[in-house]
Every structure is written in C-alpha cells, then in structure tokens.
C-alpha cells in the first residue's frame, strides 16, 4: 500500500467517500468554467462542508476549487492561495485515514 502515490490514494479515497458519495454524478450541464470570481480569503475549516476540485479541462482552461460553506453559500478559491494549498496538503497527508472534509474531482462526461 505504501508504494501507491499519494495522488492516486487521494483519488481512491475521493471515489469511495460515503457521506456524500456520487453527488457530482447527477449530470454535467455544460463544458465551461464554473467560477465567475475567485477569492484568496481564508475560510476556517469549521465553516466548510465540502471542497470540490475541478481540474483543468472539459472546456475550462484553469483548475477551479469550489468551497461549499455550511451557511449554504459557495466560494471559488484561488488555487494559488496559500491557505488552500496548505489545507490540501494536510488532506493529502491524511489520505491514508479518513478525510475530514470531502474532496471531489470534476466529472468527465
């Protein structure tokens, strides 16, 4: 198991998350970017319901990170923001156990 790369392990965990499994499999409405504007403002973990990673591709030339907040609003976070990079790194390091915040990848239609 320790020979599996962390990115592969993260993807495996992503696909097997139980609390919100398959929520991104509903439908894919269009091939374009979803984020209108991005923020670098720090969002404490206690306010976050879910982090959604949309890799570059499928009509969007950039990577997008959507943070779903517990107050039922979303924020697109600048992937270059230090805090989100740190948080993603923590999630990767913990990927051998259970992810505290669900992370999802863009669905390929």
């Amino acid at each position: 198991m320790k020979f599996i790369s962390t990115s592969l392990l993260l993807m495996l965990l992503v696909s097997s998350l139980s609390p919100v499994q398959g929520v991104l499999e509903v439908y894919y409405t269009s091939l374009r970017c979803r984020c209108v504007q991005e923020s670098s403002v720090f969002i404490p973990r206690r306010f976050i319901d879910r982090i959604q990673i949309l890799p570059r591709g499928n009509g969007c030339p950039r990577k997008e990170i959507i943070v779903w907040k517990k107050n039922k609003s979303i924020v697109c976070v600048d992937p270059q923001a230090e805090w989100i990079q740190r948080m993603m790194e923590v999630l990767r390091k913990r990927s051998s156990s259970t992810l505290p915040v669900p992370v999802f990848k863009r669905k390929i239609p």
Epitope: V20, R34, V75
Partner: antibody, heavy 123, light 113 residues
C-alpha cells in the same frame, strides 16, 4: 426516475391549519446538496416561494409567511411536510413541492416538480 | 422583496422564428460574495408543472434543447429561443434566488401564431 407528489386536503376552512406532504422517489434527502422546497400559485397570479429544507435539516422560509410556516422532513419515508397555520381564502392556490440538487452550487434551480395539489380555503 | 417584471406578458410567435423574453429585477441579482447571478427560467406547459430551463443566469438544465439560452447581468435578463417550436408553448417565468425571499416574475405566455 425522480418523482415528487403532493398530498393533503383540497378544502380547508379559514383559521384552520393546512398540512401538505411531499412524497418523493428517485433521490434521497440525505444526499449532500439535496433540497426540497414548496412553491404555490394562486389562481391567475405568479408563483410564490414558501420554504425549503436542506439535507442537513437547515431551513429557509419566506419572511412574509415565516410565522405561519413549518417545514420538516422524514428522510426514512422520503417525505417533506409543510404546515401552514391560520389559513385564509387568499391562501387558495396550487401548492407544488420541488427538488433542488446542485452539482457545483447549492442552488442550481428546482429541477423536478410535483404535479401540484389544489387547496381551496373557504367556509 | 425583489420584484421581477417580465415583458411582454403575451408573445405570439411563428414556428421557426426566434423569440425573446425580458425580465427585470428591482435590485441587482449579482451575489457580490461569489460573483454568481442566481437567475433561473422556468416553463409551465399547458396542464403540466413548471420545468427548469436555465439556472444561474445562463446554464441550461439537463435535457433542455440548445435553442434556449439565458443572458444578462445585474438587473436586466433575457431568455432567447433561437427557433420556436410548437412544443415551446406555455408560460415562461423568471425567478431569482440571490435574495430571500426567492421571487418569480408574473409570467410570459408564448403562443403559436
């Protein structure tokens, strides 16, 4: 296949409490992002949003009706219940329940609607 | 509450011709927090429940033909049908969910000439 169906009394007397049940299938209200809302349409008038309930039991109400409305869910029965107190003839309308399920946002519109149930308030 | 005003209220169209419905809100529907505009369009066909056509200003709902498109910004919005078909008859509603309470326009009745 996703379906929603409203049920409840067709005739209610003024001052009485209306209880409407939305029974749905094809999705679960325990799924992250799932929301069920209630919307009504009085005869010849515009649609009016009443309330909604999220998968995590968070709720939102139309402020103008907040004191009269209560929305609850029973995830195991796949049901959402709306109660409306102190009914008045102006509350005569077709009442719809509808589902919202966002893929990239909490709010991506009500994509499935019930057939609606007509409620008449009259003595 | 945000008032949604639609024009025209009645729209007779010849099949194959384009159609356009305007919707104006009494205040901006831009969510300054995330830059999104929570404006949707619904169609209620005769004898049916409303169906979602467009959400978040310009995203087509699943299964909606690409002849339908949504555009606009701030307080002025438009639903366009590039080529009207007989099955498009019904009442079209714009709806905003940027501000609570969510509100709907009074509807535009599209009919075939």
């Amino acid at each position: 296949q996703i379906t929603l169906k409203e049920s409840g009394p067709t005739l209610v007397k003024p001052t009485q409490t209306l209880t409407l049940t939305c029974t749905f299938s094809g999705f679960s209200l325990s799924t992250f992002g799932a929301t069920v809302g209630w919307i009504r349409q009085p005869p010849g008038k515009a649609l009016e949003w009443l309330a909604l309930i999220y998968w995590d039991d968070d709720k939102r109400y139309n402020p103008s009706l907040r004191s009269r409305l209560t929305i609850t869910k029973d995830t195991s029965k796949n049901q959402v219940v709306l109660t409306m107190t102190n009914m008045d003839p102006v509350d005569t309308a077709t009442y719809y329940c509808a589902r919202r399920l966002g893929q990239y946002d909490y709010d991506e519109g009500f994509d499935y609607w019930g057939q609606g149930t007509t409620v008449t308030v009259s003595s | 509450d945000v008032v949604m005003t639609q024009t025209p209220l009645s729209l007779p169209v010849t099949p194959g011709e384009p159609a356009s419905i305007s919707c104006r809100s009494s205040q901006s529907l831009l969510d300054s927090y995330n830059g999104n505009t929570y404006l949707a369009w619904y169609l209620r066909k005769p004898g049916q429940s409303p169906q979602l056509l467009i959400y978040r200003l310009s995203y087509r709902a699943s299964g909606v033909p690409d002849r339908f498109s949504g555009s606009g910004s701030g307080t002025d919005f438009t639903l366009k049908i590039s080529r009207v078909e007989a099955e498009d008859v019904g009442v079209y509603y714009c709806s905003q969910s940027t501000h609570v309470p969510y509100t709907f326009g009074q509807g535009t009745k599209l009919e075939i000439k």
